[in-house]
């Protein structure tokens, strides 16, 4: 990762675009910290391993988070 852009927040732009949970490889939620004052959500897509920053305030993204956590709770014993 180019060091000059790792100093603070990970996201340069954020997307409102709905993401199909089936196309997700991974979903990372980075809490606010001393390095970045905002919660950041990074989706890693199965296709080409694209990583996309999502808007935590977007209704579509909130629904995605709910769907993913529901799926996780189903899987856990």
């Amino acid at each position: 990762v180019p060091l000059s852009r790792t100093v603070r927040c990970t996201c340069i732009s954020i997307s409102n675009q709905p993401v199909n949970p089936r196309s997700l490889e991974k979903l990372e939620i980075i809490p606010a910290s001393q390095f970045c004052p905002r919660v950041e959500i990074i989706a890693t897509m199965k296709k080409k391993g694209e990583k996309r920053c999502l808007n935590p305030e977007s209704k579509a993204i909130k629904n995605l988070l709910k769907a993913v956590s529901k799926e996780r709770s189903k899987r856990s014993p």
């Epitope: 060091l3 000059s4 852009r5 990970t10 694209e50 990583k51 920053c53």
Partner: antibody, heavy 124, light 109 residues
Framework: QVQLVESGGGVVQPGRSLRLSCAAS????????MHWVRQAPGKGLEWVAV????????YYADSVKGRFTISRDNSKNTLYLQMNSLRAEDTAVYYC?????????????????WGQGTTVTVSS | EIVLTQSPGTLSLSPGERATLSCRAS???????LAWYQQKPGQAPRLLIY???SRATGIPDRFSGSGSGTDFTLTISRLEPEDFAVYYC??????????FGPGTKVDIK
């Protein structure tokens, strides 16, 4: 439609200052990182500066570091470039450009929307 | 600092022909960080390709990108009259954060 319109260019003497503005419309400005890119007469493209969507991540090309300041006002949908201590080599067309939705330090989605540019001429 | 070199400097071709433009980096670049732009005289640049091979919105499928490491290619499968322009590759990396290549001019033979 999605649009970026630059203004503030002009003829200025070496050592003086100028502030460029870029008015955004047709999209949610506060969700996108923004860049300034310049092009000297008859030359190629040179990246100048970038600012993150919330206004905190700011980075500059070595050629302008310490002289230029990028900023934004999300309430006014406007991007700025404050240029101080101008030199003859800063003469160029200055473009503002939007960084693609979802861009981050791991994946670069390119500069997907550009303005038509504003011309800055530094001459005595 | 990573330097991008584009070749050839000028490519003279006829409409309908295939154009192959090369972009070479002085050090390895992640394909996640490579983009291509088109610029016509008197106009702003236009994003064609990001992530080395993903077409930007609205870009015709005659444009394709490929490559990895230090060697990247933009291919225009069949040149249309509106494709004659200057093409720039660009990488995002550390210090300077963004770098453009010097450009390749595609002109009419």
């Amino acid at each position: 439609q999605v649009q970026l319109v630059e203004s503030g260019g002009g003829v200025v003497q070496p050592g003086r200052s100028l502030r460029l503005s870029c008015a955004a419309s047709g999209f949610t400005f506060s969700r996108f990182g923004m860049h300034w890119v310049r092009q000297a007469p008859g030359k190629g493209l040179e990246w100048v500066a970038v600012i993150g969507y919330a206004g905190d991540n700011k980075y500059y090309a070595d050629s302008v570091k310490g002289r230029f300041t990028i900023s934004r006002d999300n309430s006014k949908n406007t991007l700025y470039l404050q240029m101080n201590s101008l030199r003859a080599e800063d003469t160029a067309v200055y473009y503002c450009a939007r960084e693609g939705a979802g861009s981050n330090i791991y994946y670069y989605y390119g500069m997907d929307v550009w303005g038509q540019g504003t011309t800055v001429t530094v001459s005595s | 600092e990573i330097v991008l070199t584009q070749s050839p400097g000028t490519l003279s071709l006829s409409p309908g022909e295939r154009a192959t433009l090369s972009c070479r980096a002085s050090q390895s670049v992640s394909s996640s960080y490579l983009a291509w732009y088109q610029q016509k005289p008197g106009q702003a640049p236009r994003l064609l390709i990001y992530g080395a091979s993903s077409r930007a919105t609205g870009i015709p499928d005659r444009f394709s990108g490929s490559g990895s490491g230090t060697d990247f290619t933009l291919t225009i499968s069949r040149l249309e009259p509106e494709d004659f322009a200057v093409y720039y590759c660009q990488q995002y990396g550390s210090s300077p954060i963004f770098t453009f290549g010097p450009g390749t001019k595609v002109d009419i033979k």
